[in-house]
Interface confidence: low
Amino acid sequence: ASGSASGSASTLVHNGTSARATTTPASKSTPFSIPSHHSDTPTTLASHSTKTDASSTHHSSVPPLTSSNHSTSPQLSTGVSFFFLSFHISNLQFNSSLEDPSTDYYQELQRDISEMFLQIYKQGGFLGLSNIKFRPG
Amino acid sequence: SVVVQLTLAFREGTINVHDVETQFNQYKTEAASRYNLTISDVSVSDVPFPFSAQSHHHHHH
């Protein structure tokens, strides 16, 4: 792989509404805006709606998210886990449009990938994705 | 090819890094069939909070 990070996006895509729905970042330091409907009750992982075996999923209850969870202080629990994911799409060609988040191609690819993740992580614990970046492979 | 990098958010305690990777890898076949996407070189890691979107100092699996 070569090249530095090209285009990037800081929108959150969540599974509360349609797959196209995005929300504006809450702040520059935390580019996630957690949907309010996730803050009502503790969530457990619905194993029947995932593609993993029930034995490998975690059914622990989690504390509800509240506005106080949005602190940037590392000492406080946010009630949110973040994971960085990287992968290659080998049958897709990188072009200059993917360096510019304003292009239709960039936005379409971002939307398609967002929708794909909404299919993968269907359980209640999934809050969304952010900071999509594309670079040449 | 195109390298895609992104950050996923989950309610704390609902999933771990292994299951994030497992579910994504299980979906690769479906992505190939449904959308004609060939996905490879999957890497998942925890992001400490607060994270810097630009830092990417991660321990890849």
């Epitope: - | 959308y35 004609n36 996407l37």
Partner: antibody, heavy 123, light 111 residues
Framework: EVQLVQSGAEVKKPGASVKVSCKAS????????IEWVRQAPGQGLEWMGE????????NYNEKFKGRVTFTADTSTNTVYMELSSLRSEDTAVYYC????????????????WGQGTTVTVSS | DIVMTQSPATLSLSPGERATLSCRAS??????????IHWYQQKPGQAPKLLIY???NLETGIPARFSGSGSRTDFTLTISSLEPEDVAVYYC?????????FGGGTKVEIK
Amino acid sequence: EVQLVQSGAEVKKPGASVKVSCKASGYRFIPYWIEWVRQAPGQGLEWMGEILPGTGRTNYNEKFKGRVTFTADTSTNTVYMELSSLRSEDTAVYYCARYGDDTSGGYYAVDYWGQGTTVTVSS
Amino acid sequence: DIVMTQSPATLSLSPGERATLSCRASESVNILGTNLIHWYQQKPGQAPKLLIYHASNLETGIPARFSGSGSRTDFTLTISSLEPEDVAVYYCLQSRKIPWTFGGGTKVEIK
């Protein structure tokens, strides 16, 4: 040879439930989605939803959510579609179909269909 | 939901004529270059039969007089030279978004 064989015709009263079976053969059952599509008399085709037999994962058309349930028995390679609270508008031919890749180039599509099961809802 | 609109509702042609059937989606059915639209033929009393998958790929065993074209929202099924056995109803199906949706169908008949 890929085959999907469905259960026989049913006559039901309004409010009752019906369970249609679809037995698959001639291919590896577990990794292929099974779609359910219905067709009212003289009307077009309507997608009801799908099930992935290996995991039991389902996707439903919101129109039928709460009334329809798909299940799969991997020991007999059979998928079931149960529709409850039947009304006269549910009178239709119900098809199961495989979402498979018997196409050249590895592209997937709904390629093999069952013969259809006629469900008549009448008081 | 994605609405699939087929036209015309009925097409009456003589044997040997070219049939052009249209299918329009209310939004793009393309994902990363692949058009997730399929064409089916249904004869009376029979189950639908796959003709074209992913907009333009001819299913194995289907005569070469059938072809598909189009991208994103506008698609066409063409029968280059109509045969008597082509009398049927033709449906397009989008598998881009759940719920999958069919067009209302085009009935092809011989004059």
